[in-house]
Each structure stands twice: as C-alpha cells, then as structure tokens.
C-alpha cells in the first residue's frame, strides 16, 4: 500500500492517505477478530460502486453496541460527513441481502485494496 501513498488525484476526492488509513483500520478489525465480530450481527450488503462510502456508513451504522467498528464508522463519516440528499445515490437504501458484519468488512476491505492499487481514491 505504501508505494501508492503519494498518488496525486484531482478534485475533491478522498486522498490516498485517508483511504490507506481506512484500509489499515479494516485490516486491524479482521486480524484482531477472535469471537464473531459484533456478535455476528447482520447488515445490508451494498453496491461497491458510486456512493460506496456513504452506503457503507449507512449499512454499518445499524450495528449498535459494537466498539470494534466505531472507529470505522467515524472514518467513513470523514468521506461522507453530511447526509446524502434524497434522490442522490438512490442505491444507498436498496436492501435485499443481509450478511454478517465480518463478511461485510472483508468485502469492503478487498474492494478498497483494489481501488488503492488502481489509484482510484474517489
């Protein structure tokens, strides 16, 4: 990950360092997982496309009483600090499949690593 740390990207997009910090936090969660993450809580799966950070936040915020993912929730809020207006990113609340938080985190981590390798920080 480090070799892409200085990748320059135009416009208001999450800088590489912010993305790397989020990746590292997700890595910490997956590596330090002993008991089922968040007691096996289920969350809505999301489309890992446009509006992904807001969608991930909206999904994970439904897990309560799980300190292991609170930092992740707050870091995702860094990308998406104000509520998405109605009609914007309509996929945010498409709810059809639920998965365990642990699987959600793994899927998100894999996707973010892929974006990082490709230099896509938005």
């Amino acid at each position: 990950l480090t070799c892409l740390g200085g990748f320059a990207s135009p416009g208001p997009v999450p800088p590489s360092t912010a993305l790397r910090e989020l990746i590292e936090e997700l890595v910490n969660i997956t590596q330090n997982q002993k008991a089922p993450l968040c007691n096996g809580s289920m969350v809505w799966s999301i489309n890992l496309t446009a509006g992904m950070y807001c969608a991930a936040l909206e999904s994970l915020i439904n897990v309560s009483g799980c300190s292991a993912i609170e930092k992740t929730q707050r870091m995702l809020s860094g990308f998406c600090p104000h509520k998405v207006s109605a009609g914007q990113f309509s996929s945010l609340h498409v709810r059809d499949t639920k998965i365990e938080v642990a699987q959600f985190v793994k899927d998100l981590l894999l996707h973010l690593k892929k974006l990082f390798r490709e230099g896509q920080f938005n």
Epitope: I61, G78, P81, K83, N122
Partner: antibody, heavy 118, light 111 residues
Framework: EVQLVESGGGLVKPGGSLRLSCAAS????????MSWVRQAPGKGLEWVSS???????YYPDSVKGRFTISRDNAKNSLYLQMNSLRAEDTAVYYC????????????WGQGTTVTVSS | DIVLTQSPASLAVSPGQRATITCKAS??????????MHWYQQKPGQPPKLLIY???NLESGVPARFSGSGSGTDFTLTINPVEANDTANYYC?????????FGGGTKVEIK
Amino acid sequence: EVQLVESGGGLVKPGGSLRLSCAASGFTFISYAMSWVRQAPGKGLEWVSSISSGGNTYYPDSVKGRFTISRDNAKNSLYLQMNSLRAEDTAVYYCARLDGYYFGFAYWGQGTTVTVSS
Amino acid sequence: DIVLTQSPASLAVSPGQRATITCKASESVDNYGKSLMHWYQQKPGQPPKLLIYRASNLESGVPARFSGSGSGTDFTLTINPVEANDTANYYCQQSNEDPWTFGGGTKVEIK
C-alpha cells in the same frame, strides 16, 4: 490527545476579509471531516461550514459565497477564508472535528474571536 | 430550516437532584430509524463538549449521569444526579438536514 488550536481572529471593518487557521494534532487529520462553528457574543451556536476528508464542502446560506473552507492535509491544518464581512459575523469561531452526521462535532478548539466593526 | 426549541431557558437544581432539558424540533430529525440529534455542554469560558450523539449514545469519557432519549421531534437530556460542576449551557443540535442547526441553549445552575 486531540488538540485543535485556532488563530487569525481580530478586528476588521465591514466589507473586509480575514483568514482563520486551525492547527490539528493528536489524530489522523486526513481521515476526518472538519467544521467551523461560531458563537456570537452572549448567543447560541451556529454551524458555519464543513469539509470532508476528500475536500467536499458544505455551507449554510448565511455564509455561502462569502466564506470558503479549505484544508491542507500535509500541514494538518484547516482554514476559513471570510470575505465581505458583516457586523453579524462578529463571533467566536470554533474549529471542530466533525465525526459526521451520525456522531456530531466530537472535538472543539478554544476558539478565536472575530470582530467586525467600523 | 429545522428550528430547535429548548426548554426551559434556564433552571436551578440542587446537587443530587435530577435535571431535565427538552428539545423540540420543527420537523422530524429521524433518518431510517436513527435520530440525528446530539447534545453538547458548554461551561463558562470554554468550548462546547459533545455529551450525547444520536439522541441516546453516550460519547466516550462522558459520565453515565448524562443520558439522552427521544425520537422524531421530541428529545430529552437528563442529568441524574446533578453535580456542582455541571453548571453550564446545554445545546441540542440536529444533523438530519442542511443547514445543521442548534437549539437556543438551556442554562443549568446548581443551587
């Protein structure tokens, strides 16, 4: 320990400009959104602007077009450029770490005073 | 804009007693079952401090004497039991709709 230190306040005439700065430490600055919130003398709190970790900006109508929020992640610094200042902009301006709409303004600086008067 | 009306404007409470502050929003601040209402404490000469987020969640490091409740348009901050150093102004704030707005504040004094 999270620390936010504002500077740049002072006395300015109506129509003038001022640039506020906020030096952040004790957390990974680049990973968090930041905001400015102000408090007029003896009054309540008013949200002034926010900026995401990626640089997206948000303003209320009261300052839109006059104020510009920006950040320098390399310097762990937040800025507020204030133009066309009015008497009603007189306030203590606080820099705050914004943990998003689900968590609120998690940490606040001590504030810097802006006085707009002729 | 969403208007937040706090009551009472001020109250005096004896140590050990309960203090209750209410915040009424001009429209619902709920978002998919989550109330986007937060509470702050501001002691004299100091910046505000986050106490409660999302109506009822205690921010890290805040004593359990503070609690929040409510949903939709009606919210409550409770301090029980009140201590001498709780003298401060308390503000509610909504983040459901831009522009984000604060209540007018409630001044709590300890008898």
